[in-house]
Structure formats: C-alpha cells, structure tokens
C-alpha cells in the first residue's frame, strides 16, 4: 500500500478515501514532492500583500508586499510599513527619531549618532534625524588656527605618517 | 508526511517543560508555519503560537501565552514549545500542526502529547 | 482579540439529513476561516479552507460558505461516520506584533 502512494507524483495526493489513487491536488492547494497523503493550501496574496509568484499545483504561491511596505523575511513573510527617513515604526505608527538618534533608512530604528571622541576625533557635520554625524580629523591633525571646517588634506606620501 | 509531539508528562504545579514536534517525511522549508494547539480534557481547541520555519524565523503568539510559552525551531525537522510555571489549567493534549497558507489552517497535525499539572 | 462563536453547541441529525453549523467572527476576516471534524481521540482533520476550498480528500457532501463575519458549514445527505465535533477557526497573520487567531467552541453533531 506504501509503494502506491509513493508512485503519487508532485501536484497529486495519495486519496485514502479512492483506494489510494493519486487524485490532482484541488483549487488553492499544492503537493510539492510526490507520496503526499494531502495537499497543502496555497498562499493568498492579499491585503498588505501582492502577488509575486503565483500559486501552481506542485508550487506555493511567493508574495511581495504593496507600495508603502517592505518584507520581512527571505520569503515575505510579513509586511511592514514603511517609515519616512528619520522615523521609526512603533506600535503607534511611525515616530519621529529622538534628538542624538537617526534612520537613514524607511524601515530599521533609530540608532545613536556615532561618537567622534570615542575614536579620537571630532565632530565635522552635525548629525540630524536623518543622518548620521560625520567625524573630521582628531583635534591633534590640525594645524594650529585650522578650523573645523577646512576640506580634508590630500592624501600623504609613503614614508610621511601622522605625528 | 507526519508530525509527532513529544515532551508531554505529569508535572507539580509551578514546573517547566519542554514539548517537541518532530516532522518525518519532509522537512521544515520556507512554506510552513509550525504552530502548537492544545485542547484541554472535554474542551476545545486553544491556539498558543505559530513559528515560520523559513529564514525569518517570526514567531507570534496568543495574547496569554506571551512570557511563559516559547517557542523555537530546534532543527530542520523539530520545533520546540517551553513551558514555565505551569499550573492545573494548562493540563492538556497538546498538539502540534503544520499551516502553508499564512493564515491559520492547518492541513497536518501530530497525534498529540499529554500535559498533566497536578500536585 | 478575535472571538469565534459558533452555534448550535450541538445538533442531531438523520442519516441522509442535512446540517448546518454557523460560525460567527467578532471582525472581518475576509475568507480567512477554516472547518474541522474532530473524532475522540483523533487530531483535528481539516475539511475547508478559505471558507469553501474543499480539502484534500474531503467528500463533497462538506460544503463551506461564507465571508467576512458570517460563515457556514453545511453536511447534505449526512453519513454516520460523519459523528463528530467541528470547529471553525479564523485568523491572519497582521503586519504588526499583533497576532490574531482563534477557535470557535465547536459543534457536535449526533447521527441517529
């Protein structure tokens, strides 16, 4: 009775209730390998979801998600919604990033702004809620009297390393 | 195709436990949601929580499931559900099942593993 | 939290006869929803999915209606091997940490 059911090709399953004839997989449901005593239901692209991939008798149905969401998961297996820049997604929709925090990104939190002084440097351009402050030069690689805002020095010559 | 509990045990009140579902004759892809369902002596049916058995690995659960029931794909082909301080009203059959479709409807279940809480 | 509420609690048929169990959503869950017959000491078997997809091996005489709030299973020309509980059971997954899914209190249907 095992071998009937494992000559069952994808797309059927074995019927227990035909004397294990291999029945085609009815509307919305899918067998992907063969030997199946059931088929499984097929996946609906709706609501937050659109349809990328659609549903077949040996395949599941692949969705996307609709303008104003993003997936989550390899395989879409939710929608998100999207957030402006300098937002992030919480139980009550999308907020606004506190001061000293920024998203560059319509999805993700809000992550602190890096802190130049801990790697020795200084602060070059103020960080907003939309990006991240960019670090210049420690105090110590400008010349006396060179403010914070002179453009990068080209870069120096082998044999000429930082003092 | 199948799934089968196991785990299940006769506890004291307050104990943990583990239960684990085994799939045989295929194993966990990015179709499925593995979730747990229990049903207590004479009752009917409780969800407790779903897993996606894909790379993304979300898991959601009943509103009163949350923070004493986990749980976590352990394998390719088991899913565990980790219960804390159970008491007599979580004496069940707990079962677990398989959904492809997103949405709640389960097409394979196990056999399922008794829980009994008792002092 | 969504609540399923089915009626009757039970209900008696003939063999032959026609039954109908309702399932009532506390929201729109679209088509959502699923049947199954349950036999003691059996697992749930599924019947319809998608509110009238019928299931893989499932005999015609099951029949699933219904969308939205209000949903139907109806057994015509009911057998004695179909004496058993069902339950209806509605859900989605949302596109947040909120989580819906629930079991109707089931129906038992005796064939005399």
């Known amino acids: 009775l095992q071998d009937l059911c494992s000559n069952c090709p994808a797309g059927t399953f074995c019927d227990n209730n035909r004397s294990q004839i291999c029945s085609p997989c009815p509307p919305n449901s899918f067998s992907s390998a063969g030997g199946q005593r059931t088929c499984d239901i097929c996946r609906q692209c709706k609501g937050v979801f659109k349809t990328r991939k659609e549903c077949s008798s040996t395949s599941n149905a692949e969705c996307d998600c609709i303008s104003g969401y993003h997936c989550l998961g390899a395989e879409c297996s939710m929608c998100e919604q999207d957030c402006k820049q300098g937002q992030e997604l919480t139980k009550k929709g999308c907020k606004d990033c506190c001061f000293g925090t920024f998203n560059d990104q319509k999805r993700g939190i809000c992550r602190p702004w890096t802190n130049c002084s801990l790697d020795g440097k200084s602060v070059l351009v103020n960080g907003t809620k939309e990006r991240d402050v960019v670090c210049g030069p420690s105090p110590a690689d400008l010349s006396p009297g060179a403010s914070s805002a002179t453009p990068p020095a080209p870069a120096r010559e082998p044999g000429h390393s930082p003092q | 195709q199948s799934l089968e509990e196991s785990g299940g045990d006769l506890v004291k009140p307050g104990a943990s436990l583990t239960l684990t579902c085994t799939a045989s004759?295929?194993?966990?892809?990015?179709?499925?949601?593995i979730c747990w369902v229990r049903q207590a002596p004479g009752k009917g049916l409780e969800w407790i929580a779903c897993?996606?058995?894909?790379?993304?690995?979300?898991t959601y659960y009943a509103s009163w499931a949350k923070g004493r029931f986990t749980i976590s794909k352990t394998s390719s082909t088991t899913v565990t559900l980790q219960m804390t301080s159970l008491t007599a009203a979580d004496t069940a059959t707990y079962f677990c099942?398989?959904?492809?479709?997103?949405?709640?409807?389960?097409?394979?279940w196990g056999q399922g593993t008794l829980v009994t809480v008792s002092s | 939290a969504l609540v399923m509420t089915q009626t009757p609690a039970s209900v008696s048929a003939a063999v032959g006869g026609t039954v109908t169990i309702n399932c009532q959503a506390s929201?729109?869950?679209?088509?959502?929803l699923a049947w199954y017959q349950q036999k003691p000491g059996q697992p749930p078997k599924l019947l319809i999915f998608?509110?009238?997809d019928l299931a893989s091996g499932v005999p015609s005489r099951f029949k699933g209606s219904g969308s939205g709030t209000e949903f139907t299973l109806t057994i015509s020309g009911v057998q004695c091997d179909d004496a058993a509980t069902y339950y209806c059971?509605?859900?989605?997954?949302?596109?947040?940490?909120?989580?819906?899914?629930?079991f109707g209190g089931g129906t038992e249907v005796v064939v005399k």
């Open positions: 099942a398989r959904d492809s479709s997103s949405y709640y409807m389960f097409n394979l």
């Open positions: 004759g295929f194993s966990f892809s990015s179709n499925y949601w």
């Open positions: 897993i996606y058995v894909g790379s993304s690995g979300d």
């Open positions: 929201e729109d869950i679209d088509t959502y």
């Open positions: 998608y509110a009238s």
């Open positions: 059971q509605g859900g989605y997954y949302t596109s947040s940490a909120d989580t819906r899914g629930a």
